[in-house]
């Protein structure tokens, strides 16, 4: 039978560490981390780490009992936790029968937004006390709300992560930029900034209807290639909503005309 893993929390040092071992398995060949979205309840998601590792292909894996993975997170709240994954069988070959290295993965360790994590893994039995213990570590910075996985977190959906404003912005002439976007059902206030090194144009928009809206914004200098920053003010996130960006391009001949005055917004400036 092929070895599989059974993982569980192990907070303190592994018991094997207290025992002298004449021989120990080698280190891991590779360690990788990615994010996975798991359903917790209806419309509730948890974002977890999918940690995968590859064993080094040599006879020392015959001694391998387990692999221990520890994760420390650094943001406003420091965290540290470990799991121990026991191999269910002794390894009878250095590669999988179908070819390739022995590869295992563990899904766990909840992930916070924009946090630096250090993930380290070592094989058990590990080196004796006062000896170098071969371990593999990777740094992983979890992304923010616009990441394709993180955007489903409640914290992110409330900040507007699932809203697609589909911003388009084009330079009508030297003095005017037309910005189009789709409004958000959770709010009706927006600010639009057009920036290069400085702010070239600014507008506040009030729009109650759920629609594609168009705003003409006066600019003070050359706007082609400038960044358009759209900030929504939603009921769920107030002033802390996710900002969206677009780029000003030249308007083409066929670009949609600015709608009649009842739909046009030219506030602020």
């Amino acid at each position: 039978r092929e070895p599989t893993i059974q993982c569980g929390s192990e907070t303190g040092p592994s018991p094997e560490w207290m025992v002298q071992h004449t021989l120990t398995p080698g280190d891991l060949r590779d360690l990788q981390v990615e994010l996975v979205k798991t359903s917790v309840a209806a419309e509730e998601f948890s974002i977890l780490m999918n940690i995968s590792w590859i064993l080094r292909a040599d006879a020392s894996i015959r001694l391998l009992k387990a692999t221990k993975i520890c994760v420390s997170g650094k943001n406003n709240m420091n965290s540290y936790s470990c799991v121990r994954c026991n191999y269910t069988e002794a390894f009878q070959s250095q590669t999988r029968p179908s070819g390739g290295k022995w590869t295992f993965s563990y899904v766990g360790f909840p992930v916070e937004l924009s946090t630096l994590y250090l993930i380290s893994a070592h094989n058990i039995p590990n080196a004796n006390m006062n000896e170098d213990s071969p371990s593999l570590s990777v740094n992983f910075t979890s992304p923010g709300c616009l990441n394709h996985v993180m955007k489903y977190k409640k914290q992110c959906t409330e900040a507007g992560s699932l809203w697609d404003p589909d911003i388009t912005a084009c330079k009508k002439n030297e003095k005017m930029v037309e910005v189009n976007f789709t409004t958000n059902p959770l709010g009706n206030r927006y600010t639009i900034l057009i920036q290069r090194d400085t702010t070239l144009g600014f507008s506040r928009v009030l729009e109650n209807k759920l629609m594609r809206t168009s705003v003409a914004i006066p600019v003070t200098e050359e706007s082609e290639g400038a960044v358009v920053q759209l900030t929504p003010y939603l009921h769920t996130c107030g002033n802390d909503c996710i900002r969206r960006e677009g780029t000003v391009v030249l308007c083409s001949e066929t670009s949609a005309p600015i709608p009649p005055d009842d739909n046009r917004r030219m506030l602020g400036g």
Partner: antibody, heavy 118, light 107 residues
């Protein structure tokens, strides 16, 4: 049955390179590491290195890391070893040998006699 | 690198005798040891792996033993086809090394 086929001999000039082949059959090529072993005239066996055909991971004996280049061609189930900057010291029989479950060498090719001579 | 020291380097014996070849590793190789036989002009053939396991088709007069750093290959009642060279090899961790060989010749 498992077979590893190697050409019988190669004659090469000093300073030149030679690429030795090891054509395999009778087993799943990507499932076992392929090793290369040198045997000098009237001498013992020296492990040169090994390659995993699955992902082309290579491990060399440090002594040969600037002498041998190991490759595989999965589509034809063949392993290759290129020997570079040849000198008379490189005149030897070179074997390919397939690993077993671990790195005992369960199957060997017939060997290629490389003669380096002007 | 792990050194494999094999002895004796050569042995002259008669058919029907029993011989033992020994191999010492410079460090513990955890029983990851193989033995090979090589006839003149031929490629080596696996005889024994994991110290005691006989490869397919190897006669039962061959047997291996040992642990840690000390290993041996015993051939009971030598047959004429057993003459040739014998090599031990460790496969604990790369780089793998062979013993210097034992040349077994007919007396």
């Amino acid at each position: 049955q498992v077979q590893l086929q190697q050409p019988g001999a190669e004659l090469v000039r000093p300073g030149a390179s030679v690429k030795l082949s090891c054509k395999t059959s009778g087993y799943t090529f990507i499932s076992y590491w392929m090793n290369w072993v040198k045997q000098g005239p009237e001498q013992g066996l020296e492990w040169i290195g090994r390659i995993d055909p699955y992902d082309s991971e290579i491990q060399y004996n440090q002594k040969f890391k600037d002498k041998a280049i190991l490759t595989v061609d999965k589509s034809s189930s063949a392993a290759y070893m290129q020997l570079i900057s040849l000198t008379s010291e490189d005149s030897a029989v070179y074997y390919c040998a397939r690993s077993g479950g671990f790195d005992w060498f369960a199957y060997w090719g017939q060997g290629t006699l490389v003669t380096v001579s002007a | 690198d792990i050194q494999m020291t094999q002895s004796p380097a050569s042995l002259s014996v008669s058919v029907g005798e029993t011989v033992t070849i020994t191999c010492r590793a410079s460090e513990n190789i955890n029983s990851n040891l193989a033995w090979y036989q090589q006839k003149k002009g031929k490629s080596p053939q696996l005889l024994v792996y994991d110290v005691t396991n006989l490869a397919d088709g190897v006669p039962s007069r061959f047997s291996g033993s040992g642990s840690g750093t000390q290993y041996s290959l015993k051939i009971n009642s030598l047959q004429s086809e057993d003459f040739g060279s014998y090599y031990c090899q460790h496969f604990w961790r790369p780089p793998y090394t062979f013993g210097g060989g034992t040349n077994l010749e007919i007396k």
